[in-house]
């Protein structure tokens, strides 16, 4: 196994993960792509807690550089033994891992929280509020509950989507950050096991 | 004062079809949820369908689908359900009522008969 | 669609008596439940909306209770504009649904 190689393929995954999050957050502020709501104020509150561009994007890209650049084969030594810097530097990783592990917590509580709760919207009673908070998240089972809201259009479909897009991306973010606790325990206590001929693909 | 002022009653042909208007007054017309409600002589009360007339977000009761036809007009503050191939059981009393910040606000109703 | 039944279908009461009109519903619909009262050739008239929430220029007398399927109106000391018929509704989603009316007249 090559801690290093793998430590290197989870810091791609998690660019790519982060930058996810960050587009789904972003839209949650354009429902139906308009931007009246946002300047309205008339978005959930779990909207402003920025989950997916600073939970699941922005903190996560501090672990995932920190995974790609362990693959570097400039690492300085220690004693004469190359390796011994390496297994501090894999050591050190499990350290971004564990605020990896606290950005995509975030950001899948956070999402859990705005599914359950449900979209800010106008009802069919002509009121703004949150019409779905007292159903438990019960009515992400019905559908036909859905047309409650009607403004803006689809906002129920919209959030129900981007905040399940948030759910999943910071879940195998977390999966992610927390094998890269273990790869880096593993890698910091067996040392870089692969030599530079050895090439395996992550 | 808030209030929906209905179109007055109808009579017509089996075959053809009806347009009823719905004017409403005394608050902003496109933050209110226009409902439309059906009631023949001595019965209960049957929903057809709703128009927000901000965005018009449409949404009818399947029983009425193709029956019935919402449509609104913001510039002159007024929403229309218009009723096609009309038949004895579309004789009724047909409600608008505007739900907003102020409640419920409902129109006296027009009266559609449908008679040979 | 959901269901609604209302109970009784009628009943007679004096000025100053209290009463309880209840509704039962198909489906689990929360607290999304309203109630209305209509004069005979009137428009009928919101008076609760969410179960419990008193409609503008409603009087205190009138109070909604219940959650789930079961929901209840009560009117304590009846006055002689309370008669006529009530209506109960559900705005759980669409289509709204109403029961079949509960008639109050005067004994």
């Known amino acids: 196994m090559c801690y290093g190689k793998c430590a290197r393929c989870i810091g791609h995954s998690l660019v790519g993960l982060a930058l996810l999050c960050i587009i789904a957050n972003i839209l949650l502020y354009f429902p139906n792509g308009e931007t009246k709501y946002a300047s309205e104020n008339h978005l959930s509150r779990f909207v402003w807690f920025f989950s997916g561009i600073v939970g699941g994007g922005l903190l996560m890209l501090l672990p995932a550089f920190v995974f790609i650049g362990l693959e570097q084969d400039d690492c300085c030594g220690c004693c004469g033994h190359e390796n011994c810097g390496k297994r501090c530097a894999m050591l050190s990783s499990v350290l971004a891992a564990l605020i990896g592990i606290a950005g995509s917590g975030y950001c899948v509580i956070v999402a859990a929280l705005g599914l359950a709760e449900g979209p800010l919207c106008l009802d069919s009673f002509g009121q703004w509020n949150y019409t779905f908070a007292s159903t438990e998240g019960q009515y992400l089972l019905d559908t036909s509950t859905w047309s409650q809201c009607t403004e803006p259009k689809h906002i129920v479909e919209w959030n129900v989507s981007l905040f399940s897009i948030l759910l999943a991306l910071g879940g195998i973010e977390f999966i992610l950050c927390l094998i890269q606790v273990i790869n880096g325990v593993l890698g910091g206590i067996c040392g870089f096991c692969c030599s530079r001929q050895q090439q395996y693909d992550c | 004062e808030v209030q929906v002022q209905q179109s007055g009653p109808e009579l017509v042909k089996p075959g053809a079809s009806v347009k009823m208007s719905c004017k409403a007054s005394g608050y902003t017309f496109t933050s209110y949820v226009m409902h439309w409600v059906k009631q023949k002589p001595g019965q209960g009360l049957e929903w057809i369908g709703y128009?927000?007339?901000?965005?018009?977000?449409?949404n009818y009761n399947e029983k009425f689908k193709g029956k019935a036809s919402l449509t609104s007009d913001k510039s002159s503050n007024t929403v229309y359900m218009e009723l096609s191939s009309l038949t004895s059981e579309d004789s009724a009393v047909y409600y608008c009522a505007g739900y907003g910040n102020s409640g419920a606000n409902w129109g006296q109703g027009t009266l559609v008969t449908v008679s040979a | 669609d959901i269901q609604m039944t209302q109970s009784p279908a009628s009943l007679s009461a004096s000025v100053g008596e209290t009463v309880t009109i209840t509704c039962r519903t198909s489906?689990?619909?929360?607290?999304?439940l309203a109630w209305y009262h209509q004069k005979q050739g009137r428009s009928p008239r919101l008076l609760v909306s969410?179960?419990?929430t008193l409609a503008a220029g409603v009087p205190s007398r009138f109070s909604g209770s219940g959650s789930g399927t079961q929901f209840s109106l009560k009117i304590n000391s009846l006055q002689p504009e309370d008669f006529g018929i009530y209506y109960c509704q559900h705005h759980y989603g669409t289509p709204w649904t109403f029961g079949g009316g509960t008639k109050l007249e005067i004994k």
């Open positions: 969410h179960t419990k």
């Open positions: 489906k689990n619909i929360f607290n999304f």
């Open positions: 128009i927000n007339p901000n965005n018009d977000n449409i």
